[in-house]
């Protein structure tokens, strides 16, 4: 079961998202914001530092609809 | 236990592109998270980039523009190749695994393979 | 210059302990990013000594302990051994350079 932080890494890391964001898919990097400049992705966010759910959910492609 | 090894030429001429090869065996290549390392004579380690199996790439910015990894699935390989090479590339570059029982520590290191860039 | 700072050498006597710092930023160990260490014999390539800031793989005698508080991490090595002659180095994520970062690496040698 996923903890509300966590390090999660290679198949850990596909699982949890595939759970999280279920059918709506997931992607590993998002597009640079203009502040950053950078791109910087779900690996670096949740394999090299703790992440939680919310992080994970910023990663689904698109967001759930409202029922 | 996943083991690593580094392959390639040990000579390259200045401007020429770098390129080698690291096997997988022990383990699948669909599962981690693969490395470059290199360490100049004398000096310190310094990361070139990494991928994940999705196809999800870094690189090193210093790097970035000569840099690419790549991936052989069906050979359990991936591959650097290191465009326009100078003497600063002469190092020994090695190949590492992030197996993720590491929290992203490289937990699996090849032997390494020396490099040198001269004419 | 590295982006993670550590000291070019330090010794220690055998049976003694000795630590190595690492010093980073608010972009890197400070922004909670893990801290690994390696450890490189002679001739040889890195081994991973600790992995995320305090772990320590199976293998490795826990003589070697690492720890980390808001920018810096160490790592500190007891009951000093000849073979532990080796250089050291610290490894974290940066994220203003978004890519992994390496210290310059410490040398040390027991005297």
């Known amino acids: 079961a996923y903890r509300p932080s966590e390090t999660l890494c290679g198949g850990e890391l596909v699982d949890t998202l595939q759970f999280v964001c279920g059918d709506r898919g997931f992607y590993f990097s998002r597009p640079a914001s203009r502040v950053s400049r950078r791109s910087r992705g779900i690996v670096e966010e949740c394999c090299f530092r703790s992440c939680d759910l919310a992080l994970l959910e910023t990663y689904c492609a698109t967001p759930a609809k409202s029922e | 236990q996943v083991q690593l090894q580094e392959s390639g030429p040990g000579l390259v001429k200045p401007s020429e592109t770098l390129s080698l090869t690291c096997t997988v065996s022990?383990?699948?290549?669909?599962?981690?998270?693969w490395s470059w390392i290199r360490q100049p004579p004398g000096k310190g380690l310094e990361w070139i980039g990494y991928?994940?199996?999705?196809?999800?790439?870094n690189y090193n910015p210093s790097l970035k523009s000569r840099v690419t990894i790549s991936v052989d699935t069906s050979k359990n390989q991936f591959s650097l190749k290191l465009s326009s090479v100078t003497a600063a590339d002469t190092a020994v570059y090695y190949c590492?695994?992030?197996?993720?029982?590491?929290?992203?520590?490289?937990?699996?290191w090849g032997q390494g393979t020396t490099v040198t860039v001269s004419s | 210059q590295s982006v993670l700072t550590q000291p070019p050498s330090v010794s220690g006597a055998p049976g003694q302990r000795v630590t190595i710092s690492c010093t980073g930023s608010?972009?890197?160990?400070?922004?909670?990013?893990?801290v690994h260490w390696y450890q490189q014999l002679p001739g040889t390539a890195p081994k991973l000594l600790i992995y995320?800031?305090?772990n320590r793989p199976s293998g490795v005698p826990d003589r070697f302990s690492g720890s980390k508080s808001g920018t810096s991490a160490s790592l500190a090595i007891t009951g000093l051994q000849a073979d532990d002659e080796a250089d050291y180095y610290c490894?974290?994520?940066?994220?203003?350079?978004?890519?992994?970062?390496f210290g310059g690496g410490t040398k040390l040698t027991v005297l």
């Open positions: 490894q974290s994520f940066d994220s203003s350079l978004s890519g992994s970062v």
């Open positions: 995320g800031n305090n």
């Open positions: 608010s972009s890197n160990i400070g922004a909670g990013y893990d």
């Open positions: 022990g383990g699948s290549i669909s599962s981690y998270y």
């Open positions: 590492a695994c992030i197996t993720g029982t590491t929290k992203g520590g490289m937990d699996v």
């Open positions: 991928f994940f199996y999705s196809g999800y790439t």
